[in-house]
């Protein structure tokens, strides 16, 4: 009797178990009692990345330079093009359809992780003993100056945004 379920890499149609098309190929005609499934390779600008019964291949993603995108990896008949962002920009989503400038860490915050083409800058608050007095996408929190090592004393305490101010020690009279 006609099958109700098919093996892996097959599909059921008209009571037939037909072979799926391999990645990189699209379906031209279903199998019959007397013939195999017929498949054709995707064209140069197209792909299919799974065993499939698609009658159309998918277009490769276009990395639009107007959106700050560039090609990270060229697509094949079996894989999509991978886009990344130009320097100074990162993707707005996992699918990387557009780019935005890396954010800068405000004063009082330092760069924990420098941005890449696919991830934004990660900032962290400067802990006690550290400061950042600039808005930057690259600079980490810097340690307060150690007055003691310069044989000086703290004249003005540091904050997360400012360094300590050192001064000479008072002379004993």
């Amino acid at each position: 009797e006609p099958p109700t379920a098919c093996r892996e890499k097959q599909y059921l149609i008209n009571s037939q178990c037909c072979s799926l098309c391999q990645p990189g190929q699209k379906l031209v005609s279903d199998c019959t009692e007397f013939t195999e499934t017929e498949c054709l390779p995707c064209s140069e600008s197209e792909f299919l990345d799974t065993w499939n019964r698609e009658t159309r291949c998918h277009q490769h993603k276009y990395c639009d330079p107007n959106l700050g995108l560039q090609v990270q990896q060229k697509g094949t008949s079996e894989t999509d093009t991978i886009c990344t962002c130009e320097e100074g920009l990162h993707c707005t989503s996992e699918s990387c359809e557009s780019c935005v400038p890396h954010r800068s860490c405000l004063p009082g915050f330092g760069v924990k992780q420098i941005a890449t083409g696919v991830s934004d800058t990660i900032c962290e608050p400067c802990p006690v003993g550290f400061f950042s007095n600039v808005s930057s996408a690259f600079e980490k929190c810097r340690p307060w100056t150690s007055c003691e090592t310069k044989d000086l004393v703290v004249q003005q305490a540091g904050t997360n945004k400012t360094d300590v101010v050192c001064g000479p020690q008072d002379r004993q009279r």
Partner: antibody, heavy 112, light 112 residues
Framework: EVQLQESGPGLVKPSETLSLTCTVS?????????WNWIRQPPGKGLEWMGY???????NYNPSLKNRVTISRDTSKNQFSLKLSSVTAADTAVYYC?????WGQGTTVTVSS | DAVMTQTPLSLSVTPGQPASISCRSS???????????LNWFLQKPGQSPQLLIY???NRFSGVPDRFSGSGSGTDFTLKISRVEAEDVGVYFC?????????FGQGTKLEIK
């Protein structure tokens, strides 16, 4: 249901061209399947002559030595057989078939 | 060409008894995908052939379950578990793995 019906002259003179048409109903010949011509000489077995595919491409039996042509008219959902330079040996019942469905067959006699 | 040899060429069976027909090919009928396109047909007296079994062992729709097909490679068998009067006619195997498609010479089944 799929139905196939052969039509054409029942008598052909030697050296002339045999022409038959198969009209298909219940299924488009451009959708899928291979559309075959098969013949059966009197008291003998079946011989595959060739097919035209759903996409219009062909395959023929080399034993017929380039005498056979299968074509189609998609607007009428028909496919046709032409067999040139016929002899008495081409006298047979001619069937058009999708293989799961067959026409009822038409007898062609080659005689002067 | 794949030459198809059927045995026996004739068979006389008592109703209710089993019958078996063999079809042997001169070359393997398994294709590169592991599929085997071997089919069985029955041609009843005065009728067109009708499909019984396709792809070695699949019964075509409407075919009684007393008909079964088996085999692989080059050796194939059609079995009728309990022959009935309506089963009389000529049984053909047909391979469509290789072009040209080729038929067995036929096995005539009669009722005792």
């Amino acid at each position: 249901e799929v139905q196939l019906q052969e039509s054409g002259p029942g008598l052909v003179k030697p050296s002339e061209t045999l022409s038959l048409t198969c009209t298909v109903s219940g299924y488009s010949i451009t959708s899928n399947y291979y559309w075959n011509w098969i013949r059966q000489p009197p008291g003998k077995g079946l011989e595959w002559m060739g097919y035209i595919r759903y996409d219009g491409s062909n395959n023929y039996n080399p034993s017929l030595k380039n005498r056979v042509t299968i074509s189609r008219d998609t607007s009428k959902n028909q496919f046709s057989l032409k067999l040139s330079s016929v002899t008495a040996a081409d006298t047979a019942v001619y069937y058009c078939a999708r293989l799961d469905y067959w026409g009822q067959g038409t007898t062609v006699t080659v005689s002067s | 060409d794949a030459v198809m040899t059927q045995t026996p060429l004739s068979l006389s069976v008592t109703p209710g008894q089993p019958a078996s027909i063999s079809c042997r090919s001169s070359q393997s009928l398994e294709n590169t995908n592991g599929n085997t396109f071997l089919n069985w047909f029955l041609q009843k007296p005065g009728q067109s052939p009708q499909l019984l079994i396709y792809r070695v062992s699949n019964r075509f729709s409407g075919v009684p379950d007393r008909f079964s097909g088996s085999g692989s490679g080059t050796d194939f068998t059609l079995k009728i578990s309990r022959v009935e009067a309506e089963d009389v006619g000529v049984y053909f195997c047909l391979q469509v793995t290789h072009v040209p498609f080729t038929f067995g010479q036929g096995t005539k089944l009669e009722i005792k």
